[in-house]
Structure formats: structure tokens, C-alpha cells
Interface confidence: low
């Protein structure tokens, strides 16, 4: 676990545990890839969910000189999804199959959240957006999106983690 | 440019409602998440409610929660404030104001700084 006072955290079960949320994330929605919903004009859902960006200190200089930067705003994003996929935009109607793999990518996102949150140390949590789909075609629309984005977040997760695993462990 | 205007302000008594709306010219807001804000006498001026594109995320003030609903219609070019249950403590300036960012930023949207357009106010009494 990272602990206060900017020690590590153990990248390499983070690298693990990223990496698996990434596949997960593929094969709880594999089309994501290869379907465009541009013309949908709806973009929020993607604008309004954690994007790793320039300033946040994920590249590899980034990440040497303060990586703390980087895995608040990582755990940032793993709790926002975490809820996200846990809201009813997720279990409500149509329901997911039993074995859908979001259950599983769902406690996955809380589990690497969790390797990154300091002990004894509360990082500031995002609130949520309110995401009130009445509709159960607009509820899968929202899922297709939410999963897209996520896709791309855990991705970027994974390198970094990767990255750290590979240069930072100890 | 875009240029905010505000409207729907007044005096009301409380548990009254008002809906406030605010217009743009200059430029389309389809493109803008979008967000309210207000300055009681003295105060600072703080966060309401925030829309997105779309109009599907929305993030509220506690203060607000339950009672107010803000929305919006892109094809108007405008946003709207309705304001439910009103209470003294809602008196204030009301203003809107365009988001220039199309990313997520965290608590960003609770800043003022981080709004780049602001209409003038239009302002909200409650009293009996």
C-alpha cells in the first residue's frame, strides 16, 4: 500500500491488478473498439468521467519526481468508475447477464483503488455526476459510453503502473 | 464571444418558486457544459449547480439538492434554474456561466475561476 509521507505503493500488484482490469474492461463490452457513436452528440458522459491528462504527473519524469500526483488522480478515477458501475445505471433494466464481467470489474476497480489509498490518509473523492437515465435503451447507451471511457482510463493506468513496476519498485 | 443574460429574478415569498433562464448569443452552448452560481450581500459567490453537454451529468450544491433543477435546451441556446422550496437564505445574485473546458477536472466545476463567460446576475429575494 502507498502510505502517507509519499512512500510507494506496490506497483507491482498494482500492474497485475491493472492489468486484469483491463481485459475485464474489454470483455465486459469487446465491441467498444470497433462501434463510433459520434453522431449519438451526446458527449458528456465521456467529457464528465476522470481523463489522465498532461498535468498530472503520469509520465515517466512525472513519475520519478512525485508519483503521488499521478496515483490520487488514478484513484480518483477508480472510485469514480467504481461508483458508476455500481449505480443503476448498471443495475437497472435490462439487466446484465449473470455472468457479465462488470460484477467482477466492479470489484476490481475497488481493489486497485484500495492498493492505492494511503493508510490512515483520506484522498479527496469526486462526487458523482447524476446520470439519470429514465429510459432502458438510454441506460444502455450510458453503459456503452461509461465502459468506453473506462477502457481508456484503465489502459493509461496500466502503463503507468507498468512503468513503476519496472523502474520505481524498490 | 458568447454574452450570458440572465433572467426570471424576483421577490418571492419562502416556500415560493422561480425559474431562471439564462440566453446566449455569439456562439452555440451545445458545445459547453454550463453552470450556475450565486453572491449573497457579503458573500462570496458560490457554486449552484453545473449541466453538462448533454445534459445527463448534473452536480448540485448540498444547499440546493431536492430543491433546485437546473436543465437546459440546446436548441434554445439556453439554461434554466428551477428554483423549488425557497428559503431566505437563497437570496442572492444569481449568475450563469460557460465552462470552456470540455474535460473532467475533478472539483474544478465548484470554482468560479474555472468558468470563463459570466452573464451580469439576475437577483433573488426570498421574504415574507
Known amino acids: 500500500r502507498a502510505v502517507p509521507g509519499g512512500s510507494s505503493p506496490a506497483w507491482t500488484q498494482c500492474q497485475q491488478l491493472s492489468q486484469k482490469l483491463c481485459t475485464l474492461a474489454w470483455s465486459a463490452h469487446p465491441l467498444v473498439g470497433h462501434m463510433d457513436l459520434r453522431e449519438e452528440g451526446d458527449e458528456e458522459t465521456t467529457n464528465d468521467v476522470p481523463h489522465i491528462q498532461c498535468g498530472d504527473g503520469c509520465d515517466p519524469q512525472g513519475l520519478r519526481d512525485n508519483s503521488q500526483f499521478c496515483l490520487q488522480r488514478i484513484h480518483q478515477g477508480l472510485i469514480f468508475y467504481e461508483k458508476l458501475l455500481g449505480s443503476d445505471i448498471f443495475t437497472g433494466e435490462p439487466s446484465l447477464l449473470p455472468d457479465s464481467p462488470v460484477g467482477q470489474l466492479h470489484a476490481s476497480l475497488l481493489g486497485l483503488s484500495q492498493l492505492l489509498q494511503p493508510e490512515g490518509h483520506h484522498w479527496e473523492t469526486q462526487q458523482i455526476p447524476s446520470l439519470s437515465p429514465s429510459q432502458p435503451w438510454q441506460r444502455l447507451l450510458l453503459r456503452f459510453k461509461i465502459l468506453r471511457s473506462l477502457q481508456a482510463f484503465v489502459a493509461v493506468a496500466a502503463r503507468v503502473f507498468a512503468h513503476g513496476a519496472a523502474t520505481l519498485s524498490p | 464571444e458568447v454574452q450570458l443574460v440572465e433572467s426570471g429574478g424576483g421577490v418571492v415569498q419562502p416556500g415560493g418558486s422561480l425559474r431562471l433562464s439564462c440566453a446566449a448569443s455569439g456562439r452555440t452552448l451545445s458545445s459547453y457544459a454550463m453552470g450556475w452560481f450565486r453572491q449573497a450581500p457579503g458573500k462570496e459567490r458560490e457554486f449552484v449547480a453545473r449541466i453538462s453537454q448533454g445534459g445527463t451529468a448534473i452536480y448540485y450544491a448540498d444547499s440546493v439538492k431536492g430543491r433546485f433543477t437546473i436543465s437546459r435546451d440546446n436548441s434554445k441556446n439556453t439554461v434554466y434554474l428551477q428554483m423549488n422550496s425557497l428559503r431566505p437564505e437563497d437570496t442572492a445574485l444569481y449568475y450563469c456561466?460557460?465552462?470552456?473546458?470540455?474535460?473532467?477536472?475533478?472539483?474544478?466545476?465548484?470554482?468560479?475561476?474555472?468558468?470563463?463567460?459570466w452573464g451580469q446576475g439576475t437577483l433573488v429575494k426570498v421574504s415574507s
Open positions: 456561466a460557460k465552462d470552456p473546458s470540455p474535460y473532467y477536472r475533478g472539483s474544478a466545476y465548484l470554482l468560479s475561476g474555472s468558468y470563463d463567460s
